[in-house]
């Protein structure tokens, strides 16, 4: 009689993570008597995947009833496949022996490849905010995909970026892979509403790439511009001075009025107005009683924005002459806040 052959008809099998893999194996003879076992890998370090007679293999089921007389189909199914299951699987016939069963014949092996989707890309920006004209770095990470081939693109407001570096790890063979990319983005004053997008395309995604986003509102700091103006006389001996704080982001802002270098009032920006580009404007005014002053008054509007060093703008108020209009409110969209007399 012809010697038993172990036939594994599939050289390779491709399975998506989470699905069931079917590994086919048939024997050409019932002789010699002995069990079939499945292994992943070859040699002394091989891993037992299934032993039809003993052991615990909860993920493995047999395709046919191995105990039926004359059964020669030793195919198995492995459930809930993960990338860690990738490898070459061998169907091995043993001959009963003493003290241990002896390996008699092995199949040629079936390579199981696992397609695993990349995780949702996570985009992270710099730890500290940066101002317009500065270049900041964004990173994008995605993990757990297989096979290794993957495409990553960066966009800013729909426009593809070119200044980035991408690595896929590990370099050699692995059950699954990770991608890490760093993109450089130059900030502009208009970027409060901007988004940076990392897009990952992989064979498992069927043409529907995964995207991770970062809002530049979390990254950018637009410092304010200040303008101090003197308004028309409200009443005899009273002058209204305004400080226009324009085009700042984020909103966190504290304003201090100084009169000849002495703190007069401190307030926090509250009822701000938002510009179309996402930046904010705010106005503070001070009502100065000039009759209380013999000499000229230096009024300073000092602004501390988002924890940064203070910036200031000063206005010299002449008290020798009768107060007259020295400026006008050019920011019609702004509303004043906080009247205060100085005595």
């Amino acid at each position: 009689e012809e010697e038993l052959q172990v036939i594994q008809p599939d050289k390779s099998v491709l399975v998506a993570a989470g699905e069931t893999a079917t590994l086919r194996c048939t024997a050409t003879s019932l002789i010699p008597v002995g069990p079939i076992q499945w292994f992943r890998g070859a040699g002394p370090g091989r891993e037992l995947i299934y032993n039809q007679k003993e052991g615990h293999f909860p993920r493995v089921t047999t395709v046919s009833d191995l105990t039926k007389r004359n059964n020669m189909d030793f195919s198995i199914r492995i459930g809930n496949i993960t990338p860690a299951d990738a490898g070459t699987y061998y169907c091995v016939k043993f001959r009963k022996g003493s003290p241990d069963d002896v390996e008699f014949k092995s199949g040629a092996g079936t390579e199981l490849s696992v397609r695993a989707k990349p995780s949702a890309p996570v985009v992270s920006g710099p730890a500290a905010r940066a101002t317009p004209q500065h270049t900041v770095s964004f990173t994008c990470e995605s993990h757990g995909f297989s096979p290794r081939d993957i495409t990553l693109k960066w966009f800013k407001n729909g426009n593809e970026l070119s200044d980035f570096q991408t690595n896929v790890d590990p370099v050699g063979e692995s059950v699954s892979y990770s991608i890490h990319s760093t993109a450089k983005v130059v900030l502009t004053r208009e970027d409060v509403h901007s988004q940076v997008i990392c897009e990952v395309a992989h064979v498992t995604l069927q043409g529907d790439p995964l995207r991770g986003t970062a809002n530049l509102s979390e990254t950018i700091r637009v410092p304010p511009t200040l303008e101090v103006t003197q308004q028309p006389v409200r009443a005899e001996n009273q002058v209204n001075v305004t400080c226009q704080v324009r085009k700042f982001y984020p909103q966190r802002l504290q304003l201090t009025w100084l009169e000849n270098g002495n703190v007069s009032r401190t307030e926090t920006a509250s009822t701000v107005t938002e510009n179309k580009d996402g930046t904010y404007n705010w106005m503070s005014w001070l009502l100065v009683n000039v009759s209380a002053h013999r000499d000229d008054v230096k009024l300073t509007c000092q602004v501390e924005h988002d924890g940064q060093p203070a910036v200031s703008k000063s206005h010299d108020l002449k008290v020798s002459a009768h107060p007259k209009e020295q400026g006008s409110n050019t920011a019609a969209e702004n509303t004043g806040s906080n009247e205060r007399n100085i005595y």
Partner: antibody, heavy 113, light 108 residues
Amino acid sequence: EVQLVQSGAEVKKPGATVKISCKASGFNIKDYYMHWVQQAPGKGLEWIGRIDPEDAETKYAPKFQGRVTITADTSTNTAYMELSSLRSEDTAVYYCDRGLAYWGQGTLVTVSS
Amino acid sequence: EIVLTQSPATLSLSPGERATLSCSASSSVSSSYLYWYQQKPGQAPKLWIYSTSNLASGIPARFSGSGSGTDFTLTISSLEPEDFAVYYCHQWSSYPYTFGQGTKLEIK
């Protein structure tokens, strides 16, 4: 549901023979090796041997070789373990198990004169 | 035959502590053939970890198994009251199959 139900406790005199049964349900014993394990009072587990009920092939630990016989009746889905020439040190709980994963409740054998 | 030596014989710990149980083989055992069982007084052993590192069904994730060759470990990250029992390692790589002598995990 896999279940292994063993026969009741036995008291035997030294030199006697004991035969313990292990009735399986929820699976066919022909599909698996059936193992037997000894546990003396306050001691650890010791593998005695196993049978392949499909063809009655057996393997025994050297310590028990010659005194133990493991058999199986596939028609009743039952495995048996027979231990002869009993001595006091054979006093123990004997367990059957299916393919190393599922265990019977144990049978206490007391050997006493 | 392959002799399995477990250490320590007894381990006294408090709930919440980390437990490390060792199993040393006299010759190399393929990781596929190294199992751990838990046994409580008056009960049959229960399969706890199979193929060195895989938890049997229903076993909490605080348990883990590791090792290769001749040195294997069962670790419990944070002990719960129900974890106090005897743990046996077992090899079925070659006949005769053997068990370690057991490690008794007791409450301190």
